[in-house]
Interface confidence: low
């Protein structure tokens, strides 16, 4: 589109895609598809131990000097910035001897308006500004370079795009007299995708887009576009994949109506489609064309946004997600919980499952938290015996090519794995809980009654006596 | 030149009181949250109290908790603490520090402060 | 509140060699990629100096001498080559939750 064109940094095309890259030449290396884990199953930490000593003796150097940081650069097309007008930029650790690219996008929930954006960047600048913005990061989880503690992409190239536009990575507005904030997520992600094409991502087989809360919505957004730009930049050999990790939100209606006046208190549909206007932000084209003029506000939300997507995208989900809850007025304090409110965590878990249903690549477990892929225990957690990290690779394989034209899951590789079990922290690997007002560590048991369920009801759908229950809880916390 | 100044310090007999004063400049001091620590003598460094850059959020260690209080003067470019019910263990250099935006940690420290508890 | 233990308490190190301070917190201090630790030197007389912030980044004016490294619980400082001027103490400290602490010190130095 005509809009998208005008912010191509002038006199600096990307280079053309080297030929050779898409067809490597005899003696080439070709990167190898991820491993395969079934047959280990069984001994997965004899079997990682072994993998990072072998990767350790194939680096030139010594494991000790192998720098786990990502390095900051800023970007050369000055003009993308940050809501302060200082550069948006991104973390970058090459690996390269790989064709794959993750690139994450940072959440921190948004602002909407000038009191509530005066107000983040008072308190929070570093999610609207680069000017302190440290050299190096660390990358955890999914962006970890260790195959222990990410066995899923740890050879990737890894970026790791803060997040500093407070407009869900949906904007493409400038600083100007009138605006006293840019609001350009949306334009920094492409800005980021032109820059990486000069340091070998031009040479890349995938990119997988991801992010965690406001940055995993931020990929249901911008999943497409960023496909849309490498086919128009000449490069439609790479494929485009998206990973959004809690950014799944739901329309639904609050548990206690509040007015909205800031970031947290206010519904979820009154912050977005104020939002929206304040940030000029723009969305998938193919959903836009769904809703009317005004109504775009409905593709901030993946239920609605999923089904008009081109590129695969695998959702990651707690059933229970603290910022859904913080946003439906639902704040559990160290107070016990009322029936009423009981019944609708319960019921918003139901409803996140339902949404899910369609959603053939997903991870959903029932537990009450927020965020995981960069988290460094990611790993930890199980929805019906598999791993994230495991799905997620069952998942690269049912979109390998021999797996193209069938739609059948791949044998003992599941992809689609949501808890079906209804009430918070059912699933033994939830991460802990703690209580909101304390900042203490609960057991189930202790959290569950906390949250008022009764032990009995809890109990009989597991065929078990309440003190079964209690024991198994205990130990599985 | 982006400086901190302390002053105030004095001798004080046990359950006196005593307030000392930090002036800010080379900055924008209203953009930035303050802290007090403190170093006995011979001994290592301990958190006092925080103010946010708004002072909407005010944090004492616990030791201190109720027998001083942070308050700050953004107009006038300066940092305060009223110490009150004074013990011998409050003998130390106190010094002011600006906390960094982002990272928590103290990126401009005054020269100090000597309070002295002593009967 | 963390409770951060620094090691050793003092250490002696020949000029132009390595100088290792570690320091170890009774919870993680990372969230998010982020590792909340600093480092500062405090010479007789003075304020401490910010040196390393966020574990492993060199504050501007600092000398690349000076390195950090770490996350989670454990943190490194290494100082390497070791000059004179290095002789003094070093500290620790954690931003990631009220109270930020501070580690016990240590005292390096040079023969």
């Known amino acids: 589109s005509e809009g998208r064109k005008t912010w191509r940094r002038r006199g600096q095309q990307p280079p053309p895609p080297p030929r050779t890259e898409a067809a490597p030449a005899a003696g080439q290396p070709v990167e190898s598809f991820p491993l395969d884990f079934t047959a280990v199953e069984g001994n997965m930490d004899s079997f990682m131990a072994q993998v990072k000593s072998l990767a350790q003796s194939l680096y030139p150097c010594s494991a000790q000097q192998l720098n786990e940081d990502l390095r900051l650069h800023l970007l050369l097309n000055t003009s993308v910035t940050c809501n302060d007008g200082s550069p948006a930029g991104y973390y970058l650790k090459e690996s390269r001897g790989s064709r794959r690219w993750l690139l994450f996008l940072e959440g921190g929930w948004y602002c909407f308006n000038r009191e509530n954006c005066d107000s983040r960047y008072d308190t929070m600048r570093r999610l609207m500004s680069s000017r302190d913005w440290p050299r190096t990061r660390t990358g955890t989880g999914i962006l970890s370079s260790q195959p222990e503690e990410n066995p899923y992409w740890w050879n990737a190239n890894m970026v790791f795009i803060p997040y500093c536009s407070s407009d869900v990575w949906s904007g493409a507005s400038p600083k100007s007299d009138k605006n006293e904030y840019a609001f350009m997520g949306s334009l920094i992600i492409q800005e980021v995708v032109r820059e990486l094409l000069g340091k070998g991502l031009s040479g890349a087989k995938v990119l997988l887009l991801a992010g965690s809360s406001a940055g995993g919505t931020g990929v249901l957004l911008n999943v497409d576009r960023v496909a849309e730009l490498l086919e128009e930049l000449g490069y439609p050999s790479i494929q485009v994949r998206g990973l959004a990790d809690s950014g799944w939100f739901l329309d639904n209606k609050q548990y206690r109506r509040s007015d909205c006046i800031d970031t947290i208190n206010c519904a979820p549909t009154d912050a977005i489609r104020r939002g929206i206007r304040y940030w000029s932000g723009m969305v998938p084209e193919r959903c836009q064309r769904q809703f009317k003029e005004g109504e775009e506000w409905n593709c901030f939300f993946g239920y609605k946004v999923y089904p008009t997507l081109r590129c695969p995208v695998f959702v990651v989900q707690w059933l229970f997600d603290e910022a859904q809850l913080t946003v439906d007025n639902v704040h559990l304090t160290g107070q016990p919980v009322q029936e009423g409110l009981r019944l609708y965590i319960q019921n918003l878990g139901r409803e996140l499952r339902h949404t899910l249903k369609d959603v053939p690549a997903s991870f959903a477990p029932a537990c009450l938290s927020h965020e995981i892929i960069i988290r460094s225990h990611w790993t930890d957690v199980q929805v019906k015996g598999t791993s994230l990290p495991r799905a997620l690779h069952c998942w690269d394989r049912s979109l390998h090519d021999s797996h193209k034209a069938s739609k059948t899951p791949l044998k003992g590789c599941p992809v689609h794995l949501v808890d079906s079990c209804p009430w918070p922290h059912c699933n033994p690997s939830c991460p802990t809980v703690r209580d909101q007002f304390t900042g203490q560590e609960m057991n189930v048991a202790q959290f569950l009654m906390h949250m008022g369920f009764d032990m009995q009801t809890v109990a009989q759908p597991q065929g078990l006596e309440p003190s079964e229950l209690l024991g198994m809880l205990s130990n599985g916390s | 030149e982006v400086q901190l100044v302390e002053s105030g310090g004095d001798l004080v007999k046990p359950g006196g009181s005593l307030k000392l004063s930090c002036a800010a400049s080379?900055?924008?001091?209203?953009?930035?949250?303050m802290h007090w620590l403190r170093q006995a003598p011979e001994k290592g460094l301990e958190w006092v109290a925080y103010?946010?850059?708004?002072?909407?959020?005010?944090s004492y260690a616990n030791t201190m908790k109720g027998r001083f209080t942070i308050s700050r003067d953004n107009a006038k470019k300066t940092l305060s603490l009223q110490m009150t019910s004074l013990r011998s263990e409050d003998t130390a250099i106190y010094y002011c520090?600006?906390?960094?935006?982002?990272?928590?940690?103290?990126?401009?420290w005054g020269t100090g402060t000597t309070v002295t508890v002593s009967s | 509140d963390i409770v951060l233990t620094q090691s050793p308490a003092s250490l002696v190190v020949s000029l132009g060699q390595r100088a290792t301070i570690s320091c170890r917190a009774s919870?993680?201090?990372?969230?998010?990629?982020?590792?909340?630790m600093h480092w500062y030197q405090q010479k007789p007389g003075q304020p401490p100096k910010l040196l390393i912030y966020?574990?492993?980044n060199l504050e501007s004016g600092v000398p690349a001498r000076f390195s950090g490294s770490g996350s989670g619980t454990d943190f490194t400082l290494n100082i390497h080559p070791v000059e004179e001027g290095d002789a003094t103490t070093y500290y620790c400290?954690?931003?990631?939750?009220?109270?930020?602490?501070f580690g016990s010190g240590t005292k390096l130095e040079i023969k």
């Open positions: 520090a600006r906390k960094n935006y982002n990272g928590g940690y103290f990126d401009v």
């Open positions: 080379g900055f924008t001091f209203s953009d930035y949250g």
């Open positions: 103010i946010s850059s708004g002072s909407t959020t005010l």
């Open positions: 919870k993680s201090v990372s969230e998010s990629g982020y590792s909340y």
């Open positions: 966020l574990a492993s």
């Open positions: 400290q954690h931003s990631r939750v009220l109270p930020p602490t």
